[in-house]
């Protein structure tokens, strides 16, 4: 977890002065409870946008936003903390707004934004917007929080970004397979534009369960850069076991973009459709 | 323009089963998560599933978990929601409604719904 651009960061808006802080977390009202506390954010929303670092790299972010309630608390609240959990690695990161002025009503809604922390494809996140000073123990809870999952490296969106790009978003091996004679499947891909080897892992299962029957490892060199873009053929030869019909084939790439933790694709063949056997004629008929 | 189309309420008796269908058009529709939600009569607007854009995450509301499925088919532009053991107090207009941002939340919509159906109603009764 990181923010994007951490110098040009602002939540000042006309009526307040207002700064963004890096958090640890653990704002001083915890330990320090205070008597007076805000009122909870109203109407979290979280979206996610797309934004250029200056090096000109592409990065999803969460978009986060929410407004205030029209309660007097708002002469107490002095700012906000916004915290990005990652669900999966239990990783946290905050920032602090904090006002330099005092709020007052006025014709329209607050509403604050911040849209400047860097979210990976395929995670869940939980974001809370904790107002501050935080509630004394015991006190209603003023924070409010939505769990964000972010798209994975398939969708439309997300394949243009730079961790994705990274991750070897942009191949498209458009997998075919076909059942051969003599059990054997015939594999082809379409090759990418660097000279870096690939595997081709075969994994197969019987009809209708989940636990393998075969499993092979097919190595494929480098491609020459005459060979880029082309497609690859290679022949790989099954275990002769009844049954052992469905068969998920996984390429593997190792671009040296993402070294061994690239975008692996896949593609499976199904077992073949059993033709309904006929129940069987009795040579005889029984008497009674 | 976006055009959200749902279709298959009808009546049906407690117990019994009912799918719904959404035929979305005039946008990118694998782009985005798409919900379903509810409104009994005289009541207010109900959450009740979610499916993110390419179908791998879905999120129920307590009320309908374990009855309800909610499903897509991004090649069609279409979303569904079947609904299994159907209760009287499942009555009510079911509307598609899109997310108006990109990613999905459980527990309902990111951001907030952009474009909603006409709704199609769904009556459970005896």
């Known amino acids: 977890l990181r923010l994007l651009d951490h110098r040009a960061l602002v939540c000042s808006q006309p009526g307040l002065n207002c700064t963004v802080k890096n958090s640890t977390c653990l704002d001083d009202s915890w330990i320090h409870p205070r008597n007076l506390t805000p009122s909870s954010p109203k109407d979290l929303q979280i979206q996610l946008h797309f934004a250029h670092t200056q090096q000109g790299d592409l990065f999803p972010v969460a978009h986060i936003e929410w407004t205030l309630q029209t309660d007097a608390s708002i002469l107490y609240l002095e700012g906000a903390e916004l915290s990005v959990l990652q669900l999966n690695t239990n990783e946290r990161l905050c920032v602090r707004f904090e006002f330099l002025s005092k709020l007052r009503h006025h014709h329209r809604r607050w509403r604050f934004t911040f849209s400047h922390f860097v979210v990976d494809p395929d995670q869940e996140y939980e974001v809370t917007v904790h107002h501050l000073p935080k509630p004394i123990p015991d006190g209603d809870p003023n924070h409010q929080s939505k769990n964000f999952l972010v798209p994975d490296c398939e969708h439309a969106r997300m394949k243009v970004t730079t961790p994705c790009m990274s991750s070897g978003s942009l191949w498209d091996p458009n997998i075919t397979v076909e059942t051969l004679e003599a059990h054997q499947l015939r594999v082809s891909f379409t090759l990418w534009n660097e000279s870096t080897h690939y595997q081709i892992l075969l994994t197969s299962f019987p009809h209708m369960e989940n636990h393998s029957c075969f499993e092979h490892m097919h190595h494929i060199p480098a491609p020459r850069p005459e060979e880029f873009h082309q497609r690859s053929n290679v022949t790989l030869t099954l275990r002769n076991l009844k049954g052992c019909c469905r068969h998920q084939v996984q390429i593997q790439p190792f671009f040296s973009s993402c070294l061994n933790d690239c975008l692996r694709h896949s593609a499976t063949v199904s077992c073949p459709e059993m033709p309904d056997t006929p129940e069987p004629i009795p040579d005889y008929m029984p008497l009674w | 323009q976006v055009q959200l189309v749902e279709s298959g309420g009808g009546l049906v008796q407690p117990g019994r089963s009912l799918r719904l269908s959404c035929a979305a058009s005039?946008?990118?529709?694998?782009?985005?998560?798409m919900h379903w939600v509810r409104q009994a009569p005289g009541k207010g607007l109900e959450w009740v599933s979610g499916i993110s854009w390419n179908g791998g995450t879905k999120d129920y509301a307590d009320s309908v978990k374990g009855r309800f499925t909610i499903s897509r088919d991004n090649a069609k532009n279409s979303l569904y929601l079947q609904m299994n053991s159907l209760r009287p107090e499942d009555t009510a207009l079911y509307y598609c409604?899109?997310?108006?941002?990109?990613?999905?939340?459980?527990?309902?919509?990111?951001?907030?719904?952009?474009?909603w159906g006409q709704g199609t109603l769904v009556t459970v009764s005896s």
């Open positions: 005039g946008f990118t529709f694998d782009d985005y998560a």
């Open positions: 409604a899109k997310d108006q941002g990109l990613g999905f939340c459980r527990g309902g919509s990111c951001s907030h719904f952009d474009y």
